[in-house]
């Protein structure tokens, strides 16, 4: 806290300008009117104030706006944003995407800080949903942003926003998140033709159910092994050898290298060995010929 002291004669600031660089902290506190600072906030970033001087300017704004800064001030914070705490930011009401972008630019190249996370949270909650432009902006600054959201939060993403998502934005998503995003992607891309559809839907397939994988197997999509390995195990298990062969096309040979890893390992255990042998890959571990397979889950459902 800076002590309240009277402003020395002739030092009262008439505008925010370079002369303030030479003011001591107590002089800034005493001689700069907070309302003047708020109206000329855009100048602060053009002046090489010390971090200590910036602390004083922030303190003045906090006193002027105890309920939170107005957007007219927020949009010109610049590097003063880095001095804000999450508690400060929770009081804000940021509605303009331009303001959000301007503040994210200041933090560019750094990890998502608690301040930025709070800012984004306030902004998205204020909008009510994660619209395409917002998602575009957030994933441009933080490619992992989407995967940092809970499935509940992801449910507010409208299907139209899915067009903004790039494959790398989904790299760190877990199956629960993809379960939410996949149906939205399916809806968003529904009017595309086969090959274009597959290119777009591919990165979301970790949330696809068995019936959709079966449908894809009929479309000569040639899914690569990396995508196949990210599929839900429970969605892969019911696929027949013929369906997996059609789904992977020329990439089917890659199954051999992955035979000890899920979901390939679990899928092999569910197939008849003679069906696996038709692939000619030397996959082992299938159900021996002559054995009867009982689907206990079906039996439980019937009883």
């Amino acid at each position: 806290e800076v002590e309240k002291t009277a402003c020395p004669s002739g030092k009262k600031a008439r505008e925010i300008d370079e002369s303030l660089i030479f003011y001591k902290k107590w002089e800034l506190e005493a001689c700069v009117d907070a309302a003047l600072l708020a109206t000329q906030m855009d100048r602060v970033n053009a002046i090489p104030f010390t971090y200590e001087q910036l602390d004083v300017l922030k303190h003045k704004l906090d006193e002027l706006y105890p309920q939170g800064y107005p957007e007219s001030v927020i949009q010109h914070l610049g590097y003063l944003f880095l001095k804000m705490s999450p508690e400060d930011i929770r009081k804000w009401n940021v509605t303009s995407l331009e303001t959000l972008k301007a503040l994210l630019e200041v933090n560019k190249g750094h990890e998502m800080s608690p301040q930025v996370a709070t800012l984004i949270d306030r902004f998205v909650k204020g909008r009510g949903q994660l619209d395409k432009d917002t998602l575009d902006t957030l994933t441009a600054f933080y490619p992992g942003y989407l995967c940092s959201l809970s499935p509940e939060e992801l449910s507010s993403v409208p299907p139209s926003s899915i067009w903004a998502v790039r494959p790398q934005d989904l790299d760190t998503c877990d199956p629960r998140q993809l379960d939410v995003l996949y149906p939205k992607a399916r809806l968003a891309f529904q009017n595309m033709n086969g090959s274009e559809y597959f290119v777009k839907i591919q990165s979301f397939l970790g949330g696809a159910p068995t019936e959709d994988l079966k449908a894809l197997s009929q479309q000569n999509v040639s899914m690569d092994l990396a995508t196949f390995m990210k599929l839900r195990t429970d969605a892969v298990l019911p696929l027949t050898v013929a369906e997996v062969q059609k789904l992977l096309g020329p990439h089917v040979e890659g199954l051999k290298a992955e035979e000890r890893h899920r979901p390939v390992r679990d899928w092999i255990l569910r197939q008849r060995q003679d069906d696996l042998d038709t692939l000619g890959l030397g996959l082992q571990g299938g159900i021996p010929n002559g054995y009867l397979v009982l689907d206990l889950s079906m039996q439980e459902a019937l009883s």
């Epitope: 100048r43 970033n45 053009a46 590097y79």
Partner: nanobody
Framework: QVQLVESGGGLVQAGGSLRLSCVAS????????MGWFRQAPGRERELVAT???????YYGDTMSGRVTISRDNDKNTLYLEMNSLKPEDSAMYYC?????????WGQGTQVTVSS
Amino acid sequence: QVQLVESGGGLVQAGGSLRLSCVASGIVFRLNAMGWFRQAPGRERELVATIASGGWAYYGDTMSGRVTISRDNDKNTLYLEMNSLKPEDSAMYYCSAGGARPHSWGQGTQVTVSS
């Protein structure tokens, strides 16, 4: 993403003038304080001038009185008018976004002043 592309540098006689330009993309130009810095070989980068989003300008000590910074928010362009150039003004001139504490930099444009 962010691109700051400087132009207008070159070789000029002592006492001559140059006008540098910087076209910005990938930033909210109208909300950013912008600036010009310079760096001569073996020297630290130094602030030449900055300009607030509203157009108010701050000039560093290095070229004060011989430079004018301006901006056109409609064209996302920053300018630096340099007059009465001296050989010691020879340096790489960099456009920056963020004002006195930049968050983004251009690649620079070389200014050489011959005596």
